[in-house]
C-alpha cells in the first residue's frame, strides 16, 4: 500500500518517499523505485540552507557598497551572506538591505549605548551633576568639576549642557 506520510528528511512523490537534498545541494531528479534522489551542489555564490527539494539554489545576498553595505560574513553553499553597514551607519532593518546614519546625542544628552552596525545610538538626558556640551555619537555625560577638591568654590552653577565654573575662595584680609 503506498505511503501517505514520509519520515523526516523525506518527501512524498508519485506515491513513494524520496530523500530530500541536504543543505547546500539542489534537486536534479526525484527518486524512483530503482534510483535514489539525485542532488547537485549549489554553484558559486549560491546556497540552500535547509533539507529541500528545490530545483534552484538561492543567490547569495549582495552587500551593495552604493548603499553603504559591506560583507560581515561570507556566504557558503549552506548559508547566505550577512551584510552590515560601514562605520558610522547602521542597518535600517533586520534584513540589513540599506543603512542609515548613526544618531548623535545633542548637548544636554550623553551616549547611553554606542551604535553598532545593526542598532542606533541610544541617548540619555544628563542628570543633575552631569553635562554634555557637544553633539556626539560617542561622548557620555561628564560629571561636573568638583571645585572643592581643587580648593576652589563654585562661581557659576553647572547645567546639563555646561560644566560648573570654579573660582578662588574669597580670602579674609
Amino acid at each position: 500500500e503506498p505511503p501517505t506520510a514520509c519520515r523526516e528528511k523525506q518527501y512524498l512523490i508519485n506515491s513513494q518517499c524520496c530523500s530530500l537534498c541536504q543543505p547546500g545541494q539542489k534537486l536534479v531528479s526525484d527518486c524512483t523505485e530503482f534510483t535514489e534522489t539525485e542532488c547537485l551542489p549549489c554553484g558559486e555564490s549560491e546556497f540552500l540552507d535547509t533539507w529541500n527539494r528545490e530545483t534552484h539554489c538561492h543567490q547569495h545576498k549582495y552587500c551593495d557598497p552604493n548603499l553603504g553595505l559591506r560583507v560581515q560574513q561570507k556566504g557558503t553553499s549552506e548559508t547566505d551572506t550577512i551584510c552590515t553597514c560601514e562605520e558610522g551607519w547602521h542597518c535600517t532593518s533586520e534584513a540589513c538591505e540599506s543603512c542609515v546614519l548613526h544618531r548623535s546625542c545633542s548637548p544636554g544628552f550623553g551616549v547611553k549605548q554606542i551604535a553598532t552596525g545593526v542598532s542606533d545610538t541610544i541617548c540619555e538626558p544628563c542628570p543633575v551633576g552631569f553635562f554634555s556640551n557637544v553633539s556626539s555619537a560617542f561622548e557620555k555625560c561628564h560629571p561636573w568639576t568638583s571645585c572643592e577638591t581643587k580648593d576652589l568654590v563654585v562661581q557659576q552653577a553647572g547645567t546639563n549642557k555646561t560644566d560648573v565654573v570654579c573660582g578662588p575662595q574669597d580670602r579674609l584680609r
Epitope: G68, S98, V100, L101, H102, R103, S135
Partner: antibody, heavy 118, light 111 residues
Framework: QSLEESGGRLVTPGTPLTLTCTAS????????MSWVRQAPGKGLEWIGT??????ASYASWVNGRFTISKTSSTTVDLKITGPTTEDTATYFC??????????????WGPGTLVTVSS | DVVMTQTPASVSGAVGGTVTIKCQAS??????LAWYQQKPGQPPKLLFY???NLASGVPSRFSGSRSGTEFTLTISDLECADAATYYC?????????????FGGGTEVVVK
C-alpha cells in the same frame, strides 16, 4: 493619497501655534512623517521627523522650539512655541518611510503659510 | 554633521539645450541622494532617488549620476516647463543630528 496642512495664520511674536497635517487615502502608522518649511524666496529647511514608533528627531537648529506629535493615525501636529519673525514661512508636511531610502519624500502637502509679525 | 552644497545658485539655458546642476556632500553618503523640482506656489516634486533612479512619470531627459561625494543632475532638451528650482537631498539621515538634509537650491531659467 494626499496630505493637507492646516492652522497657518498671522500671529504675533511669542504666540504659540499648532499646525496639523491630515492624511487622506492612507494611515500614517507605517510611515515617517516630516515637517519642512520654506521662508519666502528661500530654500527648503527640514524641521524634524516623527517615526512610526512616535519617536521624533529634529534639525540641530530647532533647540526645542518645535514639537512634532502624532495625534491620530491620520494626523501629525507641529507645535511652534514662541515663534519669531524668522519663522515666517510656508510649512510643508511630507511622507517618507521607503524601506531603503528612509527619508525620501514621495508625497507632500500643498503647504500652509505662517506669518509672524507684530 | 552632513552638509549638502549645491552649485550654481542659478543657471540658464536655451530651449533644446542642456543644463547641469551639482550637489556636493561634506562626507560619504553613498547613493543616498534625491533630487526634487519645485515650481512657484507648489510643493517639491520627486525626480530622482538613489542618485540615479528616475521617479515614476519623470521624462528621461532628466539624468542623475554620482561620483564619490559629488552628485550631478543633468537636464537635456530643455523645455519651458523645466523652469523651476531644483534641490538635492540626503535621504538617509535617520535620527542623526543634522542641520538640514537639503542643498540650497538651484534656479533653472529657460530662455
Amino acid at each position: 493619497q494626499s496630505l493637507e496642512e492646516s492652522g497657518g495664520r498671522l500671529v504675533t511674536p511669542g504666540t504659540p501655534l499648532t499646525l496639523t497635517c491630515t492624511a487622506s487615502g492612507f494611515t500614517m502608522n507605517r510611515y515617517r512623517m516630516s515637517w519642512v518649511r520654506q521662508a519666502p524666496g528661500k530654500g527648503l529647511e527640514w524641521i524634524g521627523t516623527i517615526n512610526n514608533d512616535a519617536g521624533a528627531s529634529y534639525a540641530s537648529w530647532v533647540n526645542g522650539r518645535f514639537t512634532i506629535s502624532k495625534t491620530s493615525s491620520t494626523t501629525v501636529d507641529l507645535k511652534i512655541t514662541g515663534p519669531t519673525t524668522e519663522d515666517t514661512a510656508t510649512y510643508f508636511c511630507a511622507r517618507a518611510g521607503d524601506n531603503i531610502y528612509v527619508d525620501l519624500y514621495n508625497l507632500w502637502g500643498p503647504g500652509t503659510l505662517v506669518t509672524v509679525s507684530s | 554633521d552632513v552638509v549638502m552644497t549645491q552649485t550654481p545658485a542659478s543657471v540658464s539655458g536655451a530651449v533644446g539645450g542642456t543644463v547641469t546642476i551639482k550637489c556636493q556632500a561634506s562626507e560619504n553618503i553613498f547613493s543616498y541622494l534625491a533630487w526634487y523640482q519645485q515650481k512657484p506656489g507648489q510643493p517639491p516634486k520627486l525626480l530622482f532617488y538613489g542618485a540615479s533612479n528616475l521617479a515614476s512619470g519623470v521624462p528621461s531627459r532628466f539624468s542623475g549620476s554620482r561620483s564619490g561625494t559629488e552628485f550631478t543632475l543633468t537636464i537635456s532638451d530643455l523645455e519651458c516647463a523645466d523652469a523651476a528650482t531644483y534641490y538635492c537631498q540626503f535621504t538617509n539621515y535617520g535620527s542623526s543630528d543634522i542641520r538640514s538634509p537639503f542643498g540650497g537650491g538651484t534656479e533653472v531659467v529657460v530662455k
